[in-house]
Interface confidence: low
């Protein structure tokens, strides 16, 4: 059977993509349960994930209230079955997380090419404006809504028959590129926030090629 000793959580790690934000930690609890608290630097602590045996806590609802704030979380350890009990100093053991600023640190999710349309020697490539969990006036904002012109997309494109890649950039969600008539091209996009020092780039989108259903070809 378990002892009454609790241990402090460790390896507190923020996992965040497009503002979906989860705090993870170790260890799996043996004789304890956890409660998480989160606050901004100047704010009050708010408790979440009460007396859980999980080693993670979804804090998205808290951080989306202001994604430009810097947040700190802490994980409290309580004896299992006796959550009123405290540590030897009269309060439960806890461990602080690193600071986390969602706007600067959330990972950019893998983008998706929504469509491409060829008109003569021009191709218009549109990137899906992914919805985030950030709300304004009861509606969910898109990635572009949140980041504005801080967010750019890089397009990689190449002839299906060769491996030489070209690139284009846009601070909207659309590209207009020149192509050779009669050639099929493949496309991949990447989201980038150039002003960041960490997590600047997303992973590349799935490759989409002309001649597949997603695109539209019009010979003019």
């Amino acid at each position: 059977s378990g002892t009454t000793n609790t241990v402090a959580a460790y390896n507190l790690t923020w996992k965040s993509t497009n503002f979906k934000t989860i705090l993870e930690w170790e260890p799996k609890p043996v004789n304890q349960v956890y409660t998480v608290q989160i606050s901004t630097k100047s704010g009050d602590w708010k408790s979440k994930c009460f007396y859980t045996t999980d080693t993670e806590c979804d804090l998205t609802d808290e951080i989306v209230k202001d994604v430009k704030q810097t947040y700190l979380a802490r994980v409290f350890s309580y004896p299992a079955g006796n959550v009123e009990s405290t540590g030897s100093a009269g309060e439960p053991l806890y461990e602080n997380s690193p600071e986390f600023t969602p706007y600067l640190e959330t990972n950019l999710g893998q983008p998706t090419i929504q469509s491409f349309e060829q008109v003569g020697t021009k191709v218009n490539v549109t990137v899906e404006d992914e919805r985030t969990l950030v709300r304004r006036n009861n509606t969910f904002l898109s990635l572009r809504d949140v980041f504005g012109k801080d967010l750019i997309y890089t397009l990689y494109y190449w002839k299906s028959s060769s491996s030489g890649k070209k690139t284009a950039k846009t601070n909207t969600n659309e590209f207009l590129i020149d192509v050779d008539k009669g050639e099929n091209y493949c496309f991949s996009v990447q989201a980038v926030i150039p002003s960041r020092t960490v997590n600047r780039k997303s992973t590349d989108s799935p490759v989409e090629c002309m001649g597949q259903e997603k695109g539209e070809f019009r010979e003019i």
Epitope: G2, N31, T55, A80
Partner: antibody, heavy 125, light 108 residues
């Protein structure tokens, strides 16, 4: 009674990505357990690859971390393994398993109490 | 990484005899994370013992586990024909979770 069933191609070419799915039946993948992948090389012991919680959080074996992705689809009660850039050394029987937290007398215990039958994956050109 | 070393590698015994299998950890492991499994050829592992000493559902009482810290033992008090198999210990507390190399219990 919870049962697990692995599925996926039995033959993968070198440098390609191995993809396997584990389907949970007789219970829900969202019921508070962790879900693991383990492999066993021919005639050898067991190697833990990684685990996922129903919310999507993962832990991986550091020796494989750069090549492994484990994901979950709660709507289908499935979790999946992708192992990229495979070589012949990845030839093994791959098992999925449930890692259960069990509360008893003031403490929690962890163990893998339900296993799939295993699926053999051969990496060869 | 916690290395689990099982000994002996092979145990040759007759039905009715007592089998004692050892599992030694390279660093201390909470007993809450220590389990034993049985594996027969062509089959998946089967949970025998969890928490170092608690028998899993449906496991006969001839199987028992003991130990703490770095030394753990699986004992089969009286071997039945169906007990000849490979036995693995495992810790599931510290990433990466690790298994011992296994002990094969074979018929003498």
């Amino acid at each position: 009674q919870v049962q697990l069933q692995e599925s996926g191609p039995g033959l993968v070419k070198p440098s390609q990505t191995l993809s396997l799915t584990c389907t949970v039946s007789g219970g829900s993948i969202s019921s508070g357990q962790y879900w693991s992948w383990i492999r066993q090389h021919p005639g050898k012991g067991l190697e833990w690859i990684g685990e996922i919680y129903y919310s999507g959080s993962t832990r991986y074996n550091p020796s494989l971390k750069s090549r492994v992705t484990i994901s979950v689809d709660t709507s289908k009660d499935q979790f999946s393994l992708k192992l990229s850039s495979v070589t012949a050394a990845d030839t093994a029987v791959y098992y999925c398993a449930r890692d259960t937290p069990y509360y008893y007398d003031g403490g929690y215990y962890y163990y893998m109490d339900v296993w799939g039958k295993g699926t053999t994956v051969t990496v060869s050109s | 990484e916690i290395v689990l070393t099982q000994s002996p590698g092979t145990l040759s015994l007759s039905p009715g005899e007592r089998a004692t299998l050892s599992c030694r950890a390279s660093q201390s492991v909470s007993s809450s994370y220590l389990a034993w499994y049985q594996q027969k050829p062509g089959q998946a592992p089967r949970l025998l013992i969890y928490g170092a000493s608690s028998r899993a559902t449906g496991i006969p009482d001839r199987f028992s586990g003991s130990g703490s810290g770095t030394d753990f033992t699986l004992t089969i008090s009286r071997l039945e024909p169906e007990d000849f198999a490979v036995y693995y210990c495992q810790q599931v507390g510290v990433v990466p979770y690790t298994f011992g190399g296994g002990t094969k219990v074979e018929i003498k």
